[in-house]
């Protein structure tokens, strides 16, 4: 599967949509900045095999999809942009799932790197908790939008793993 190219293209499209989704000036939200601790160091210090990279990227995109599929999210963003963004994420999930089947065969389950998957889940839990604490305010969503854009850009090491042959 030609995942690096398709993923890169879809990722760029998703980032463009995410950038367009802003509703209020981020300049007014500086005091709402928060440390979400994206597990950057863990990712940077690891050479991902292709199936590992796929499973971690899948988790990141799945969690992002879940986050932006809530009722609170629907109230926060312009509907047509949100739908396009969700569709883009959904397509990425499909691409990754199709690739997993091709890489390891239908019967086999990819070796899930539990530590990395758990780190991603905890990261998104912190984001969800922050939104709850901030009562899903427009500024809280702006901060989260900026954070998700950053985490998408940070997953470079995972993308390198997509180019590897296991």
């Amino acid at each position: 599967c030609d995942l690096p190219q398709t993923h890169s293209l879809r990722n760029r499209r998703a980032l463009i949509l995410l950038a367009q989704m802003g509703r209020i000036s981020p300049f007014s939200c500086l005091k709402d900045r928060h440390e979400f601790r994206f597990p950057e160091e863990e990712f940077d210090g690891h050479q991902f095999q292709k199936t590992q990279a796929i499973s971690v990227l899948h988790e990141m995109i799945q969690q992002t999809f879940n986050l932006f599929s809530t009722e609170d999210s629907s109230a926060a963003w312009e509907q047509s942009l949100l739908e396009k963004f969700s569709t883009e994420l959904y397509q990425q999930l499909n691409d990754l799932e199709a690739c997993v089947i091709q890489e390891v065969g239908v019967e086999e389950t990819p070796l899930m790197n539990e530590d990395f998957i758990l780190a991603v889940r905890k990261y998104f839990q912190r984001i969800t908790l922050y939104l709850m604490e901030k009562k899903y305010s427009p500024c809280a969503w702006e901060v989260v939008r900026a954070e998700i854009m950053r985490s998408f850009s940070f997953s470079t090491n995972l993308k390198k793993g997509l180019r590897r042959k296991d």
């Epitope: 950038a19 981020p26 500086l30 440390e35 950053r150």
Partner: antibody, heavy 121, light 107 residues
Framework: EVQLVQSGAEVKKPGESLKISCKGS????????IGWVRQMPGKGLEWMGI????????AYSPSFQGQVTISADKSISTAYLQWSSLKASDTAMYYC??????????????WGQGTLVTVSS | DIQMTQSPSSLSASVGDRVTITCRAS??????LNWYQQKPGKAPKLLIY???SLQSGVPSRFSGSGSGTDFTLTISSLQPEDFATYYC?????????FGQGTKVEIK
């Protein structure tokens, strides 16, 4: 390597216009805001304003609002600071610096080398 | 606008001394406070961000503390290269504002 490279020193006459630049490299230009800071001779740092290059949204310090214009061209990773009519009191060193926006990362971690603007008749 | 007041405005110290500079904000800025060092003819250099986080590459003799309205920059053992002007800056709300600076001179 992250770098902010500013345009060279300028000597102008009162009433003239001027546009100085700050070119970013070694990072995603649209992922960071660019702020401008003035330092008059022998004085402290004064924050002038900021731009988000991704959409050219700007914010100014009240002291500089209407006095200067901040802009950016993301296609060439460059931010600008401009004056339509310079005054002798605009004589200063001007610095640009990058800011991580709403992300939890160091503020103004990289600075340009500064552009010295001298306004004299 | 939030006013930032630094004290002292200048101080004389010797190599090896422990130096403390304080910065007070006119209203609460949480932990959104940065410290910069500037040497003559050079651009400012970030030392501390978010009140107490040491910027990468900055020696550990520099430390920051505080939250709300009162903040401190400490140099545990002053080195010859530390003689410079230090500025605090709030990034809690726009417009960002700097303190007036503290010049650290050789005694």
């Amino acid at each position: 390597e992250v770098q902010l490279v500013q345009s060279g020193a300028e000597v102008k006459k009162p009433g003239e216009s001027l546009k100085i630049s700050c070119k970013g490299s070694g990072y995603s230009f649209t992922s960071y805001w660019i702020g401008w800071v003035r330092q008059m001779p022998g004085k402290g740092l004064e924050w002038m304003g900021i731009i988000d290059p991704s959409d050219s949204d700007t914010a100014y310090s009240p002291s500089f609002q209407g006095q200067v214009t901040i802009s950016a061209d993301k296609s060439i990773s460059t931010a600008y600071l401009q004056w339509s009519s310079l005054k002798a009191s605009d004589t200063a060193m001007y610095y640009c610096a990058r800011h991580p926006g709403l992300n939890w990362a160091p503020d103004f971690d990289y600075w340009g080398q500064g552009t010295l603007v001298t306004v004299s008749s | 606008d939030i006013q930032m007041t630094q004290s002292p405005s200048s101080l004389s110290a010797s190599v090896g001394d422990r130096v403390t500079i304080t910065c007070r904000a006119s209203q609460s800025i949480s932990k959104f406070l940065n410290w910069y060092q500037q040497k003559p003819g050079k651009a400012p250099k970030l030392l501390i961000y978010f009140a107490s986080s040491l910027q990468s590459g900055v020696p550990s003799r520099f430390s920051g503390s505080g939250s709300g309205t009162d903040f401190t920059l400490t140099i545990s053992s002053l080195q010859p290269e530390d003689f410079a002007t230090y500025y605090c800056q709030q990034s809690n709300t726009l417009p960002f504002t700097f303190g007036q600076g503290t010049k650290v001179e050789i005694k």
